[in-house]
């Protein structure tokens, strides 16, 4: 049995229904069997867990996803073995295996792999600060969302109408969410907002930076 699956990875928003397309061509016999299984990201195929079986004319959902899995066509004997997974969770991200067996059709191994990513908006990020906050010193502002798929990009902006710091004294890394401020001055003080963004949305946090004279010590 030769199984056909999309070559492109599949992306489905959190809470929506994922349709994992799997088709095949074979003269379906009574021994026809379909198995869908799941592998977590980074794990080998050998560690897959079954989520649905079809055999002897009956459908058997199994495992932790059993209440949420079904087939687009039941019985899946018309050449369409497409899986529907409702109310997708972040833990549904991974590789799905569609395997069709129909002895004596051993033309190929009857296996197709589909990568699913569940799209999750960024959670409210946590803003933090470390370093020397006195004039002339340097500080790092950090921003991180615990959730978000694809991984959010981070953008820091300074609120208000204060003079803009010179470009060399304000460097940010959109991937790590870190903003490094060097050669601090009193005018560096103010409120800084970090916005975490991905294709599903955005979330933000704010942090107030207080730059002091060296003799006054470090105040956050």
């Amino acid at each position: 049995v030769e199984v056909k699956v999309p070559t492109e990875p599949l992306s489905t928003p959190l809470g929506k229904t994922a349709e994992l397309t799997c088709t095949y061509s074979t003269s379906v016999g009574d021994s026809f069997a379909l198995e869908w299984s799941f592998v977590q990201p980074g794990k080998p195929i050998s560690e897959s867990h079954p989520i649905l079986y079809f055999t002897n004319g009956h459908l058997y959902p199994t495992g932790s996803k059993s209440k949420r899995v079904s087939l687009l066509q039941n019985p899946p004997t018309v050449g369409v073995a497409t899986l529907k997974l409702t109310d997708v969770h972040p833990s549904d991200t991974g590789t799905y295996l569609c395997q069709v067996n129909n002895p004596p059709d051993f033309y190929t191994n009857g296996l197709g792999l589909i990568n699913l990513t569940v799209l999750v908006p960024p959670s409210n990020p946590l803003c933090s600060q470390s370093g020397q906050t006195s004039v002339g010193g340097s500080t790092a502002l950090r921003c991180s969302s615990s959730e978000g798929a694809p991984k959010p990009v981070y953008n820091w902006v300074r609120l208000g109408t204060f003079p803009t710091p010179s470009p060399g004294s304000m460097v940010q890394d959109e991937v790590s969410g870190q903003l490094i401020l060097t050669n601090l001055s009193l005018t560096s003080s103010g409120t800084y907002r970090c916005v975490a963004t991905n294709q599903m949305g955005s979330a933000s946090c704010e942090l107030t930076l207080s730059v002091t004279e060296p003799s006054q010590g470090r105040v956050a």
Epitope: E2, T23, S25, T26, D30, G57, G79, D105
Partner: antibody, heavy 118, light 107 residues
């Protein structure tokens, strides 16, 4: 030598019923998916029913679904097509065909003519 | 349902000619295509399956090619026995459907 011989065709009134038979020989019938394919006079070919090797799975196009029933008796190496609620547009030569490992038709019978007319 | 469209409907040719018949599918059917030959009053005969595979006993002058949505049947040198009607059929997902046929007649 593979042989498929259809029988049971004839003249039937609209709304009537007919049962076609196909006697198979020359191959292991119980290992083969089977189908019925029809051809209206002067027209092309249309697949009308299929059945799996042991009879567990049957399939039909929308044009005959609910009216036609395919079945088989592996002990007799025979295939059947029960046709109910016949319409004028069901008039055709009906062929019995063996499916390959994939669903193409590698052997065909000589056909039996079904005429639906009042 | 997947629609199969053949062209031309009729083709006039002479013995020895190279003949090409086209079959188009309304959606991707990969290589799941079969070709049949039918003579008047006779049952169809399988010529090609999986777009290009010839069953045992089919003369090598017949060849098939294509994948996706566009397919061709070629007869490299037409013989007197080849005047007939040719049908394509997809063998992908049910319902399996045929093209409307191409009649190859003597010029």
């Amino acid at each position: 030598e593979v042989q498929l011989v259809e029988s049971g065709g004839g003249l039937v009134k609209p709304g009537g019923s007919l049962r076609l038979s196909c006697a198979a020989s020359g191959f292991t019938f119980s290992n083969s998916g089977m189908s019925w394919v029809r051809q209206a006079p002067g027209k092309g070919l249309e697949w009308v029913a299929s059945i799996s090797d042991g009879g567990l799975y049957t399939h039909y196009p929308d044009s005959v679904k609910g009216r036609f029933t395919i079945s088989r008796d592996n002990a007799k190496s025979s295939l059947y097509l029960q046709m109910n609620s016949l319409r004028a547009e069901d008039t055709a030569v009906y062929y019995c065909a063996r499916q390959g490992v994939q669903p193409f038709f590698d052997y065909w019978g000589q056909g039996t003519l079904v005429t639906v007319s009042s | 349902d997947i629609q199969m469209t053949q062209s031309p409907s009729t083709l006039s040719a002479s013995v020895g000619d190279r003949v090409t018949i086209t079959c188009r599918a309304s959606e991707n059917i990969y290589s799941y295509l079969a070709w049949y030959q039918q003579k008047p009053g006779k049952a169809p005969k399988l010529l090609i399956y999986n777009a290009e595979t010839l069953p045992e006993g089919v003369p090598s002058r017949f060849s098939g090619s294509g994948s996706g949505t566009e397919f061709t049947l070629t007869i490299s040198s037409l013989q007197p026995d080849d005047f007939a009607t040719y049908y394509c059929q997809h063998h992908y997902v049910i319902p399996w459907t045929f093209g409307q046929g191409t009649k190859v007649e003597i010029k």
